[in-house]
């Protein structure tokens, strides 16, 4: 039975040209995590972290994706095309797969500064 839950950073925004951390956390289960997959909105793989073999960045993203922190992923040199959904898939046993969703909105620099200024603390 799958008892775990995935907590994510949810809906986030970041500045064009900047970087953003995508984070997922699996809780409420004793299942062993064997691999975490990170996918983009079009289901193309960004990176994986295999429990035994470590991080592997997909070749197309090697210049713009950095592993971590933890099981998260750092997306760098953001463009407007990076706006969209991102998915973390936790491969575990005996539970199976857990999937989390993050929505990233990449904003033009001036808009990002403006929205940040009016965020409620």
């Amino acid at each position: 039975m799958m008892t775990g839950t995935i907590e994510t950073t949810g809906n986030i925004s970041a500045k064009k040209g900047g970087s953003v951390i995508l984070q997922c956390h699996l809780s409420s289960t004793m299942a062993q995590v064997t691999q975490v997959n990170w996918e983009q909105h079009d289901h193309s793989l960004l990176a994986i972290r295999n429990a035994e073999l470590g991080w592997h960045i997909y070749p197309a993203f090697k210049d713009r994706v950095a592993p971590g922190p933890g099981l998260g992923l750092t997306l760098q040199s953001l463009t407007m095309n990076d706006t969209g959904e991102y998915f973390c898939t936790y491969h575990t046993y005996p539970d199976g797969t857990y999937r989390g969703r993050i929505f990233l909105e990449v904003l033009e620099s001036s808009v990002a500064e403006h929205s940040a200024r009016f965020q409620i603390p």
Partner: antibody
Framework: QVQLVQSGTEVKKPGASVKVSCKAS????????ITWVRQAPGQGLEWMGW????????NYAQKLQGRVTMTTDTSTSTAYMELRSLRSDDTAVYYC??????????????WGQGTLVTVSS | DIQMTQSPSSLSASVGDRVTITCRAS??????LAWYQQKPGKVPKVLIY???TLQSGVPSRFSGSGSGTDFTLTISSLQPEDVATYYC?????????FGGGTKVEIK
């Protein structure tokens, strides 16, 4: 097309070492892992370990720890498996195979043709 | 370590028969299971991964099912070219242990 081509038959004396090579072509070598599997005459398949061609991380079967070393050379897209302190029960066909771990399911999708290693005094 | 046990170790069936091979894991592995076919004198070939996903190019008469500890490989209509030894393998994490194999022959 994906191909894994292994080195030729080896005959070794007990106590010696053997190094088997596996040259990959038809895919981005550094984006996958290579596993090694052996099969003694008339017996089943035995997993020996695997190595990431991306970062060099390895994981070996417990019974072979200390006797086996797996390495890769990304400049030549070649994987190597060295087995030391050979015994007669190491006589087997040794296979390399590519691991598809991007799916999260770690299955072996392409195999080399096998290398027969005979250990005999 | 998780052990993989296959049954039967060998079987003989007629062309056109439905053939079922079972594989049991000593602990739950969800659907992290692959099936391989090895024809006599040949290299192993993956048939199924993720317990039930047919590898590209594999005939549709092969199917896989199961989750947790109990898994099945089915050949819906046995063909002469299916004479081989079939192996299950846990594919969640190391060690990526194989089952002992099931030898399939034609009656």
């Amino acid at each position: 097309q994906v191909q894994l081509v292994q080195s030729g038959t080896e005959v070794k004396k007990p106590g010696a070492s053997v190094k088997v090579s596996c040259k990959a072509s038809g895919y981005t070598f550094s984006s996958y892992a290579i596993t090694w599997v052996r099969q003694a005459p008339g017996q089943g398949l035995e997993w020996m370990g695997w190595i990431s061609a991306y970062n060099g991380n390895t994981n070996y079967a417990q019974k072979l720890q200390g006797r086996v070393t797996m390495t890769t050379d990304t400049s030549t897209s070649t994987a190597y498996m060295e087995l030391r302190s050979l015994r007669s029960d190491d006589t087997a066909v040794y296979y390399c195979a590519r691991v598809d771990f991007w799916s999260g399911y770690n299955y072996f999708d392409y195999w080399g043709q096998g290398t027969l290693v005979t250990v005999s005094s | 370590d998780i052990q993989m046990t296959q049954s039967p170790s060998s079987l003989s069936a007629s062309v056109g028969d439905r053939v079922t091979i079972t594989c049991r894991a000593s602990q739950g592995i969800s659907n992290y299971l692959a099936w391989y076919q090895q024809k006599p004198g040949k290299v192993p070939k993956v048939l199924i991964y993720a317990a039930s996903t047919l590898q590209s190019g594999v005939p549709s008469r092969f199917s896989g099912s199961g989750s947790g500890t109990d898994f099945t490989l089915t050949i819906s209509s046995l063909q002469p070219e299916d004479v081989a030894t079939y192996y299950c393998q846990k594919s969640n994490s190391a060690p990526l242990t194989f089952g002992g194999g099931t030898k399939v022959e034609i009656k």
